[in-house]
């Protein structure tokens, strides 16, 4: 029998300094690009090596950002979402949600070393 | 992981026309920002156009402009580079190249770090 895969969702308030290059990272999602079905949030697709993001190391691919200096990002086209970004400032406080993918044993769970498991 | 390959090289007069094609795979082409490059024998390789997620904002190479328009069909999974007036300059392996979402930092089109994934390229040879 297969374990069913939970998600653990946590929240983290991310500050990050704009770098020479900028923040570094790219997102998918708003309104008119949905990223994930029935959800129109915006999600980290990509962080750049050696960019900011990269560099301080918290914000990861697949987060879901909540909001940018406090201002949400529900309902928002995605180039919106963009340019919400690229005026956020040198210090952008993002709030993030992290989805952890947890795999549960199957019910009856075997030791581990149980060539049977 | 995102595949890319490339189609409609081929040999060609001066002042012909060429399209080149780029499918993809996945199902979430239409979040990809995508561009084409160029690489000439013994040069380096060459931005020659640019095309965000939607197709609503396009950028191109100086050389190019006004002779080269970029397109895409998010229906087909599919971009395209229809090449008008071509040089025997225009001479080269033209590579498409993907990044999953949108940078949101000022966009630098022609560095090719901005992309992650690359096509193997189809030549394109103009006499």
């Known amino acids: 029998m297969n374990g069913r895969v939970d998600y653990l969702v946590t929240e983290e308030e991310i500050n990050l300094t704009r770098g020479p290059s900028g923040l570094g990272f790219n997102i998918v999602g708003g309104t008119d690009q949905q990223y994930v079905s029935n959800d129109s949030g915006i999600y980290v697709s990509r962080i750049k090596e050696n960019g900011a993001a990269a560099l301080d190391g918290r914000l990861q691919e697949g987060d879901k950002i909540l909001s940018v200096n406090g201002q949400d990002l529900k309902n928002l086209l995605h180039q919106d979402a963009v340019d919400l970004f690229r005026n956020a400032g040198y210090a952008v406080s993002l709030r993030v949600q992290h989805r952890l993918q947890v795999q549960n044993g199957p019910i009856g769970h075997r030791g581990e070393g149980d060539p049977s498991g | 992981q995102v595949q890319l390959v490339e189609s409609g090289g081929g040999l060609v007069q001066a002042g012909d026309s060429l399209r080149l094609s780029c499918a993809a795979s996945g199902r979430t082409f239409s979040t990809y920002t995508m561009g084409w490059f160029r690489q000439a024998p013994g040069k380096e390789r060459e931005f020659v156009a640019h095309i965000n997620w939607s197709g609503s904002s396009t950028y191109y190479a100086d050389s190019v402009k006004g002779r080269f328009t970029i397109s895409r069909d998010n229906a087909k999974n599919t971009m395209y580079l229809q090449m008008n007036s071509l040089k025997p300059d225009d001479t080269a392996v033209y590579y498409c190249?993907?990044?999953?979402?949108?940078?949101?930092?000022?966009?630098?089109?022609?560095?090719?770090?901005?992309?992650?994934?690359w096509g193997q390229g189809t030549q394109v040879t103009v006499s």
């Open positions: 190249a993907v990044t999953i979402g949108s940078p949101v930092d000022s966009y630098r089109h022609g560095d090719p770090l901005e992309y992650d994934y």
